[in-house]
């Protein structure tokens, strides 16, 4: 049986203020049933960065086409990076629940840090 793996290949991502950052996340199975969300940080105070099903995230776009069938690429792009965006980003698989979805597995995280400005 295929066990779901959440793959975030970059441990560290150096970004430049004003530019766009791409955070990669792929999964190895469509199961269990349920959505993938992006967060910054961990624990109860973590910040929701992207939920495709609901919410408004004007600076976030998906890498994969949202009409793609059986998508396993949950990578996102964040535009107009500011110093406030630094932190560790996690893609998290939720298992469908009724009424609430339940966190199932998290990726290892990608730390976003500011790199030196290009000269």
């Amino acid at each position: 049986e295929e066990e779901l793996q959440m793959i975030q290949p970059e441990k560290l991502l150096l970004v430049t203020v004003g530019k766009t950052a791409t955070l990669h996340c792929t999964v190895t199975s469509l199961l269990p049933v349920g959505p993938v969300l992006w967060f910054r940080g961990v624990g109860p105070g973590r910040e929701l960065i992207y939920n495709q099903k609901e919410g408004h995230f004007p600076r976030v776009t998906t890498v994969s086409d949202l009409t793609k069938r059986n998508n396993m690429d949950f990578s996102i792009r964040i535009s107009s990076i500011t110093p406030a965006d630094v932190g560790t980003y996690y893609c998290v698989k939720f298992r469908k629940g009724s009424p609430e979805n339940v966190e199932f597995k998290s990726g290892p995280g990608t730390e976003m840090a500011l790199g030196a400005k290009p000269s």
């Epitope: 199975s29 469509l30 199961l31 269990p32 049933v33 495709q52 099903k53 949202l66 069938r69 059986n70």
Partner: antibody, heavy 120, light 108 residues
């Protein structure tokens, strides 16, 4: 080519039990959710149950009476139906789930169905 | 539970005519709607998903539109093989998945 072949239907008395099977081929069975959808004679479609990995979901009308399961080594989906009632009489279809975008499930392949008749 | 209401229940049309089928949801389902065709004695067949995306191999005469609560399946020029019952299904909020009651497209 994706194929879903149901079996196990038949005539059973009210209160009886039946086990349906669905043999799947042509896709990576273990990474997809699969479902049962039924259709009473002359009526519309009614979702019955879905199974992901070990996560299962049921319509209220069958909860506690029906059990969905899967055997990934045999590429087979099952539906154990207990305490059957006359209103369970229907053609039972096995369907492969498909997702779009980041969530949302619909049914992209269907079997031809197996008829279950509950009658005394 | 989200209720889907399809109209009309029956539609009598001639080959070559344009056909418009309606599906209305009891609450916002975004674009999480699929359409199926079912011919007598056969299993349903997926036509449209995500409200407007045609499934592989579905002829271009079939198109879907709408978002929120109102959805439409259009057959631009009905062919003889298109007669049957058409169902919409929502997958925005489940369990349960829910289907509309169907629209029967029959020969005039």
């Amino acid at each position: 080519e994706v194929q879903l072949v149901e079996s196990g239907g038949g005539v059973v008395q009210p209160g009886g039990s039946l086990r349906l099977s669905c043999a799947a081929s042509g896709f990576s069975f273990s990474i997809y959710a699969v479902s049962w959808v039924r259709q009473a004679p002359g009526k519309g479609l009614e979702w019955v149950s879905t199974i992901g990995a070990d996560d299962t979901y049921y319509a209220d009308s069958v909860k506690g009476r029906f059990t969905i399961s899967r055997d990934n080594s045999k590429n087979t989906l099952y539906l154990q139906m207990n305490s059957l009632r006359a209103e369970d009489t229907a053609v039972y279809y096995c369907a492969k789930d498909s997702t779009v975008g980041w969530s949302g499930d619909f049914f992209d392949y269907w079997g031809q169905g197996t008829l279950v008749t509950v009658s005394s | 539970e989200i209720v889907l209401t399809q109209s009309p229940a029956t539609l009598s049309v001639s080959p070559g005519e344009r056909v418009t089928l309606s599906c209305r949801a009891s609450q916002n389902v975004r674009s999480d709607i699929a359409w199926y065709q079912q011919k007598p004695g056969q299993a349903p067949r997926l036509l449209i998903y995500a409200a407007s995306s045609r499934d592989t191999g579905i002829p271009a005469r079939f198109s879907g539109s709408g978002s929120g609560t109102d959805f439409t399946l259009t057959i631009s020029s009905l062919q003889s093989e298109d007669f049957g019952v058409y169902y919409c299904q929502q997958y925005y909020d489940w369990p349960p998945f829910t289907f509309g009651g169907g629209t029967k497209v029959e020969i005039k």
